[in-house]
Each structure stands twice: as structure tokens, then as C-alpha cells.
Interface confidence: medium
Amino acid sequence: QEGPLPRPSISAEPGTVIPPGRPVTIVCRGPVGVDQFRLEREDRSKFNDTKDVSQASPSESEARFRIDSVSEGNAGHYRCLYVKSTRWSEHSDYLDLVVKETSGDTDSPVTEPDSSAGPTQRPSDNSHNEHAPASQGLSAEHLY
């Protein structure tokens, strides 16, 4: 019997406190050789799976779940787990995503409630729109 799989880690870029309408990328990391990552909300009733896994370093693989335009509905506790060679890992610690207006002048656009997740990438100039960034990657309706 093999030993337990290492626990994954979870983080958010650029951070865990995001103004409404801004993008955020939740990053799940695990060992090399992960076949699939899952990002879950706290109650496990909502999740998103991706097989779009990249090698972050010689010892780590990662998946990046992007939300193009966060709203209050995206706030909450997230955690990751992964599949490697048909085995599921333990869960990561919880990440608490906070959706919070900036201080001082309100500095985020009014946004639509829908969003999407998937591998983050630098958008082309043609897709840039500060009000409604172009959707990228996987549909996230089950998770977000």
C-alpha cells in the first residue's frame, strides 16, 4: 500500500481580498503527476474539475481557476484536492475569498453576476474591457 498523497495547497492571485468586478485566480498546487484538480466550495455541493494541469516547478504541478469578474456570490471558503493515479488526495486548507469594495473612492465597475474560470492568461488588447473582461477557460456555473 502506497503512503498518503501530499496535501495540496491553495492560494489566490493577486490576493484573497478582491474588489467587486476585479479578476482573481485561485491556484491549486500539488505534486508532479497530478491528473486532475478539483476546486470546491465549503459545503462540497459546488465544485469545478480541471485536467488543465501545468508544472509549476520541478516538484509541483498546479491548476489555475480564474474568475474574470468577482461578485459577492464568489465570496466564501474554497479548498482543493486532486487525483493522481486514480487516487484522491486529502483536501487543502480552506482559502477565504473576500469580496470587498476598495477604500476611499469606489473604484470597481458594476458587473454582471456571471463569471468563468480556467487557466489564467494575459488577454489580448482586443479582448480587454475594464467593465466586462472577456470570459476565458472553463465554464464555472457549477462552482461560482
Partner: antibody, heavy 121, light 107 residues
Framework: EVQLVESGGGLVQPKGSLKLSCAAS????????IHWVRQAPGKGLEWVAR??????????YYADSVKDRFTISRDDSQSMVFLQMNNLKTEDTAMYYC????????????WGQGTSVTVSS | DIQMTQSPASLSASVGETVTITCRAS??????LTWYQQKQGKSPQVLVY???TLEDGVPSRFSGSESGTQYSLKINSLQPEDFGSYYC?????????FGSGTKLEIK
């Protein structure tokens, strides 16, 4: 190629007015926020003003040092941004840069070469 | 308003050395920080955004880090083209203030 070209700088007396222009090209202008940043001779960078896109009703923001004196505006049909500067003070003497904001990555990613404003009697 | 306190104001170093420039925010800016490089007589250019992410084309000897409200730009193995001025800027809330700058000079 993304380009921002400023014009309109020059010598003006205290309490005078000046209007700076910025001509943008090489990107989808109407979806980007644009900023003005200035730099006094031998000094650091100072954020001056910002105007956002039509989708945010052209929201504007100003540094306290220029509020009620400067007005930022834009003309999407001409891909132009303007900075109307009134009641100028000697401390407004600076190089004024027109800059594009990359909203995805929270950076001022393309800068013009600047236009020089001198306020002196 | 958030204030950015940058240090040192000037720094003298030799080619090959490692230097670190810091900016301290007066409040929590949640990694919404960009670092710029400006050469004499030129416009600034982005080096690092979101506190830690290297802009495309920027050499890997540059790196950004964060600890609480303190943000650092580290330059490993200084090259002749690295000399100039460096500025931080926060993007958490308007006004998007800059740090006062650090002039990096050749020793």
C-alpha cells in the same frame, strides 16, 4: 504597436490655463482607462488623474493636489484624452505623461514620451 | 488615502551585487502593487505587477515579494542596464499613489 503621444505643453503664467492632449493608437482605445502622471524636474512620479471607459460612465478620479483645478476628459471617436489645467501653480511644473491602465494586471503598462509644462512668471 | 513609503531614496551598488528596494503601504493594499523602472530621460516601464508577477520580457533577476504591508523588489546580480530609478505604485484605491522613488547608481 501601442502608442500614446502627448501634446499641448509649454510655458504658462501662474493662474493661467493649459490643455494637454493625448493621441492613442494601436489598441482598442474605448475599453481602456487612461491616466495622467507627472514628474517635476529631478523629482519622482506623481499620479494626477484617471478616466475610465464608457462602460463605467467615464468615471474620473483626481489627486488631491489638482482636484477642482484639473479636468480629465476623453473622445473615444478620436482616441484622444485631454487634461484641462486651470489656475496653474508653479508647483505644477512637470513633465506630464499620458498612460494606459491595464485593468487585468493593475499596472500602467504603456506610457507616452511626455509633454513639458512650465508655470512661471 | 494610502501612502507609500519607499526606501532607500538612493542606493549605490556594483555590477554583480544584489540589491533590495522596499515600499511600505500605510494600509493593506492586498498585493495590488506595481514596480516600475525609469531610465534617465525616458518614460517608466513595468517590471512587476500584482506584487510578485514579472512582466513579460523582464529578466528573471528581478523579483517581487510581500510581507504584510511591506513590498520588496529584489535585483540579483546587477547588470549595467539596471541602473536608474525605481518606483512602486499601489492600485488598491484612488489615489493610486507612487512611492518617492529609489535612484540606483553605479558604485
Amino acid at each position: 504597436e501601442v502608442q500614446l503621444v502627448e501634446s499641448g505643453g509649454g510655458l504658462v503664467q501662474p493662474k493661467g490655463s493649459l490643455k494637454l492632449s493625448c493621441a492613442a493608437s494601436g489598441f482598442t482605445f474605448n475599453t481602456y482607462a487612461i491616466h495622467w502622471v507627472r514628474q517635476a524636474p529631478g523629482k519622482g512620479l506623481e499620479w494626477v488623474a484617471r478616466i475610465r471607459s464608457k462602460s463605467t460612465n467615464y468615471a474620473t478620479y483626481y489627486a488631491d493636489s489638482v482636484k477642482d483645478r484639473f479636468t480629465i476628459s476623453r473622445d473615444d471617436s478620436q482616441s484622444m484624452v485631454f487634461l484641462q489645467m486651470n489656475n496653474l501653480k508653479t508647483e505644477d511644473t512637470a513633465m506630464y505623461y499620458c498612460v494606459r491602465e491595464n485593468w487585468y494586471y493593475y499596472a500602467l503598462d504603456y506610457w507616452g514620451q511626455g509633454t513639458s509644462v512650465t508655470v512661471s512668471s | 488615502d494610502i501612502q507609500m513609503t519607499q526606501s532607500p531614496a538612493s542606493l549605490s551598488a556594483s555590477v554583480g551585487e544584489t540589491v533590495t528596494i522596499t515600499c511600505r503601504a500605510s494600509g493593506n493594499i492586498h498585493n495590488y502593487l506595481t514596480w516600475y523602472q525609469q531610465k534617465q530621460g525616458k518614460s517608466p516601464q513595468v517590471l512587476v505587477y500584482n506584487a510578485k508577477t514579472l512582466e513579460d520580457g523582464v529578466p528573471s533577476r528581478f523579483s517581487g515579494s510581500e510581507s504584510g504591508t511591506q513590498y520588496s523588489l529584489k535585483i540579483n546580480s546587477l547588470q549595467p542596464e539596471d541602473f536608474g530609478s525605481y518606483y512602486c505604485q499601489h492600485f488598491w484605491s484612488t489615489p493610486f499613489t507612487f512611492g518617492s522613488g529609489t535612484k540606483l547608481e553605479i558604485k
